[in-house]
Interface confidence: low
């Protein structure tokens, strides 16, 4: 069965950092790209940015830039997000979610990781 | 940044009433090469990831009944719900792919 | 990884065609775009065109349009560029590349930059 | 079609010196869209850098790009042997065009 499991919720303090893991299994991860969106509470879902699976190349919004890392190990299925530098209004529900080129919709998202930022 | 714009931010229908949502882009997301808009809309209810209802413009993913459909082309699209159900109650996206991803702002459906 | 394999080089006459082609392995074929760039010697590097194989349809730098044909055998993984009307200013190395630009509307993943390379091909135009 | 204009030709430098690079776009480019490359003599060409300043995998944190609008940099903050090749840079604009290249040689 196709799926992406995220990792849980985290609590941090401004300024801190968090890693999100997201774990594919049931279809092989090289053929697909992984992007990470995020939800704040009562806001619109926001693009953050993607990782190619295969090559690990990857692209974030600008906004973002420079304050997220997203990385891969294939051997364990996994992609990751990581954000810095965190602030309050980073406190937000990030999904995972597949892609595959020549497509380019979500047909498969994790559940969704509550990040809260409080001091 | 293609910057997506969805109308009404909420709708209020009755059970078995049709219900419709709009979407612009601001610019077009018709790929003349391949003949595909890439614009998707996914249904998302509280609590829940998003879930894809339509991609390319209108084509139903697989499982989701026949009473949503997706229309439009260029800049301009539409989803239409022709006989809301009560388990239609949700939030729906828009979301374009034609560069990056940029997400519409929701319009919530509730039930009149 | 993705590893690009070309044909061999190439002598031909003025006003022949060429047709190079570009095997690939170690990923999965219809999942990339596959762009055509060329070299001629002591030059610079020169896009010629590129193709989405999934969806079949090429398309061509200005400078080389009527001249190039791009396609791609899925069932192979394999990417062809056939140059026609040969002469001797073709003479160059020719090089596929992963990625292809974005006015595809590939959603952000071709942004113009190419990466693995194959080999090259030289193909030499000479009477 | 946008000219991108690759400056010095040449750069004479010693190992473990810094090498700046640039890069002049005949107009605006977005930053999304800008590439460099190394070549090696008799081997194609390598991606270092994608979307002006991230780095390809693989490629050692000496190399770095920067910049905007219609001026772009490569750095290399301590040259080792190995760095020592021709250095492109390259745009996505309607089509694709390369500058001229950098000849980065042993002083």
């Known amino acids: 069965q196709v799926q992406l499991v995220q990792s849980g919720a985290e609590v941090k303090k401004p300024g801190a950092s968090v890693k999100v893991s997201c774990k594919a299994s049931g279809f092989n991860i090289k053929d697909y790209y992984m992007h990470w969106v995020r939800q704040a509470p009562g806001q619109r879902l926001e693009w953050i940015g993607w990782i190619d699976l295969e090559n690990a190349n990857t692209v974030y919004d600008a906004k973002f830039q420079g304050r997220v890392t997203i990385t891969r190990d294939t051997s364990a299925s996994t992609a990751y997000m990581e954000l810095s530098s965190l602030r309050s209004e980073d406190t937000a529900v990030y999904y995972c979610a597949r892609d595959a080129y020549g497509r380019y919709f979500y047909d498969v998202w994790g559940q969704g990781t509550l990040v809260t930022v409080s001091s | 940044d293609i910057v997506m714009s969805q109308s009404p931010d909420s709708l209020a229908v009755s059970l078995g009433e049709r219900a419709t949502i709009n979407c612009k882009s601001s610019q077009s997301l018709l790929n003349a090469r391949t003949g595909k808009n890439y614009l998707a809309w996914y249904q998302q209810k509280p609590g829940q990831p998003p879930k894809l209802l339509i991609y390319w413009a209108s084509t139903r993913s697989s499982g989701v009944p026949d009473r949503f459909s997706g229309s439009g082309s260029g800049t301009d699209f539409t989803l239409t719900i022709s006989s809301l159900q009560a388990e239609d109650v949700a939030v729906y996206y828009c979301v374009q792919s034609y560069f990056r991803r940029t997400f519409g702002g929701g319009t919530k459906v509730e039930i009149k | 990884q993705v590893q690009l394999v070309q044909s061999g080089a190439e002598v031909k006459k003025p006003g022949s065609s060429v047709k190079v082609s570009c095997k690939a392995s170690?990923?999965?074929?219809?999942?990339?775009?596959i762009s055509w760039v060329r070299q001629a010697p002591g030059q610079g590097l020169e896009w010629m065109g590129g193709?989405?194989?999934?969806?079949?349809?090429?398309n061509y730098a200005q400078k080389f349009q009527g001249r190039v044909t791009i396609t791609a055998d899925e069932s192979t993984s394999t990417a062809y560029m056939e140059l026609s009307s040969l002469r001797s200013e073709d003479t160059a190395v020719y090089y596929c590349?992963?990625?292809?630009?974005?006015?595809?509307?590939?959603?952000?993943?071709?942004?113009?930059?190419?990466?693995?390379w194959g080999q090259g091909t030289l193909v030499t135009v000479s009477s | 079609e946008i000219v991108l204009t690759q400056s010095p030709g040449t750069l004479s430098l010693s190992p473990g010196e810094r090498a700046t690079l640039s890069c002049r776009a005949s107009q605006s480019v977005s930053s999304s869209y800008l590439a460099w490359y190394q070549q090696k003599p008799g081997q194609a060409p390598r991606l270092l850098i994608y979307?002006?300043?991230s780095r390809a995998t693989g490629i050692p944190d000496r190399f770095s790009g920067s910049g905007s609008g219609t001026d772009f940099t490569l750095t290399i903050s301590r040259l080792e042997p190995e760095d020592f090749a021709v250095y492109y840079c390259q745009q996505f604009g309607r089509d694709p065009t390369f500058g001229g290249g950098t000849k980065v040689e042993i002083k």
């Open positions: 170690g990923g999965t074929f219809s999942s990339y775009a």
């Open positions: 590349a992963r990625g292809a630009p974005n006015y595809y509307g590939s959603g952000g993943y071709d942004d113009g930059w190419f990466d693995p």
């Open positions: 979307g002006a300043s």
């Open positions: 193709i989405i194989p999934i969806f079949g349809t090429a």
